[in-house]
């Protein structure tokens, strides 16, 4: 990737990622410098007859750093702080080639939950107020609520009325997704409204 247009690479929190490096064809490489956010990460001197000299210059990421045979950078056990700009400079006798990358760390979604604040009206209509959440949600998480294949809400919250006298059993499903994972959680309107009805009759007695 040229320095003008960094290659955007997705990594998953806790997993590994490779930043691919392409060599100039037919040229002898003198050394390769890898940088993270403009700070030196590693300095590599290739040798034709023996193993390359690899000098890791960033102790923070050092133990999680590895290099492939073609000197692509491999970073394991990814952390959120690995997010940022990476550059590789390949120096030959005649030129210096620069490759740029932007690493984005995404979380696998975990622990989807639905909270319910529902109420029963005098006419026995049940109004459901449902809120969906996942652990450590960020702006890259999309939420939606579906029932019978229709999207009823595009937000973590759903407000819907359910009348047991005219409605059949109905499940509402929250779907949370990001670029690397998705989770869903279904709730039964009938069950939620029965619970509200029990509370309603308990308080009346």
């Amino acid at each position: 990737q040229s320095s003008l247009t960094p290659l955007m690479v997705n990594g998953i929190l806790g997993e590994s990622v490779t930043l691919p490096l392409e060599f100039p064809a037919g040229e002898k490489v003198n050394f390769i410098t890898w940088l993270f956010n403009e700070t030196s990460l590693a300095f590599i001197v290739p040798h034709e007859t023996k193993s390359p000299e690899i000098h890791v210059t960033n102790p923070k990421q050092g133990k999680r750093l590895n290099f492939t045979q073609s000197y692509s950078l491999q970073l394991s056990n990814l952390k959120m702080e690995d997010t940022g700009s990476y550059r590789a400079q390949i120096s030959t006798k005649t030129s210096a080639k620069l490759s740029s990358y932007t690493l984005r760390i995404l979380r696998q979604l975990r622990n989807i939950q639905v909270t319910n604040h529902s109420q029963l009206f005098q006419n026995m209509t049940c109004e459901l107020h449902l809120t969906c959440s996942v652990e450590d949600a960020d702006d890259n998480v999309s939420f939606r609520w579906e029932a019978l294949g229709n999207t009823l809400s595009s937000q973590p919250n759903l407000t819907v009325s359910w009348d047991p006298r005219i409605s059949s059993e109905q499940d509402y499903t929250c779907i949370a997704e990001n670029a690397v994972s998705n989770l869903s959680f279904s709730v039964s309107a009938q069950k939620l409204c029965e619970d509200v009805k029990i509370q309603y009759t308990d308080t009346k007695m």
Epitope: M8, V9, N10, T102, R104, D139, N140, S142, R144, W145, E146, T151, L152, S153, S154, Q155, P156, N157, L158, T159, V160, I175, E177, N178, A179
Partner: antibody, heavy 118, light 106 residues
Framework: QVQLVQSGSELKKPGASVKVSCKAS????????MNWVRQAPGQGLEWMGW????????RYADDFKGRFVFSLDTSVSTAYLQISSLKAEDTAVYYC???????????WGQGTTVTVSS | QIVLSQSPATLSLSPGERATLSCRAS?????MHWYQQKPGQAPRPWIY???NLASGIPARFSGSGSGTDYTLTISSLEPEDFAVYYC?????????FGGGTKVEIK
């Protein structure tokens, strides 16, 4: 039917403010996020950000942080976009668009042209 | 942010011809949405989640792709298909649109 109706065109002087409205009908307003999209003359579409119509919490794209404010009046199912300290480069058509999930904009307002000129 | 590059910028074709519109993302995305826009009009939803046609969209339109490469195909152009088409990604904030491909009559 589901529709979004926006307020009419505005001609403003640099430094002034403008408030664009987007009235929703035909669906439960608080169940779907509302997005704002800008289109400068002869240009493409730019996502400005969105507002959670249930909580009222806005989220702005980086280029639209500061002078741009999203707000709501849920009692009349209306979303608003306010732009302050107007500049000539704010001249554009501004669209509101409903998010049907996965940031797919299934219903769009007709657009409001804001012209900033001295 | 994820940059979407649409190509070609302009596609000059005759009615009845096949049109292939490309959208390339600077990073892998899960799905792509497409919109059609005609002069003086608001964009219209066209294809959602890569391959699903929006309500009322004729079957001559199709969408495909994965990762960084997505395509909108019109199997046989009708006069009403000449317009600008935009792709849009949802995987990462900010939600970004491509620069558009204008399909014009040759």
């Amino acid at each position: 039917q589901v529709q979004l109706v926006q307020s009419g065109s505005e001609l403003k002087k640099p430094g002034a403010s403008v408030k664009v409205s987007c009235k929703a009908s035909g669906y439960t307003f608080t169940n779907y996020g509302m997005n704002w999209v800008r289109q400068a003359p002869g240009q493409g579409l730019e996502w400005m950000g969105w507002i959670n119509t249930y909580s009222g919490e806005p989220r702005y794209a980086d280029d639209f942080k500061g002078r741009f404010v999203f707000s709501l009046d849920t009692s009349v199912s209306t979303a608003y976009l306010q732009i302050s300290s107007l500049k000539a480069e704010d001249t554009a058509v501004y669209y509101c668009a409903r998010d049907y999930g996965r940031w797919y904009f299934d219903v769009w307002g007709q657009g409001t042209t804001v012209t900033v000129s001295s | 942010q994820i940059v979407l590059s649409q190509s070609p910028a302009t596609l000059s074709l005759s009615p009845g011809e096949r049109a292939t519109l490309s959208c390339r993302a600077s990073s892998s995305v899960s799905h792509m949405h497409w919109y059609q826009q005609k002069p003086g009009q608001a964009p219209r939803p066209w294809i959602y989640a890569t391959s699903n046609l929006a309500s009322g969209i004729p079957a001559r339109f199709s969408g495909s792709g994965s990762g960084t490469d997505y395509t909108l195909t019109i199997s046989s152009l009708e006069p009403e298909d000449f317009a600008v088409y935009y792709c849009q990604q949802w995987s990462s904030t900010p939600r970004t649109f491509g620069g558009g491909t204008k399909v014009e009559i040759k």
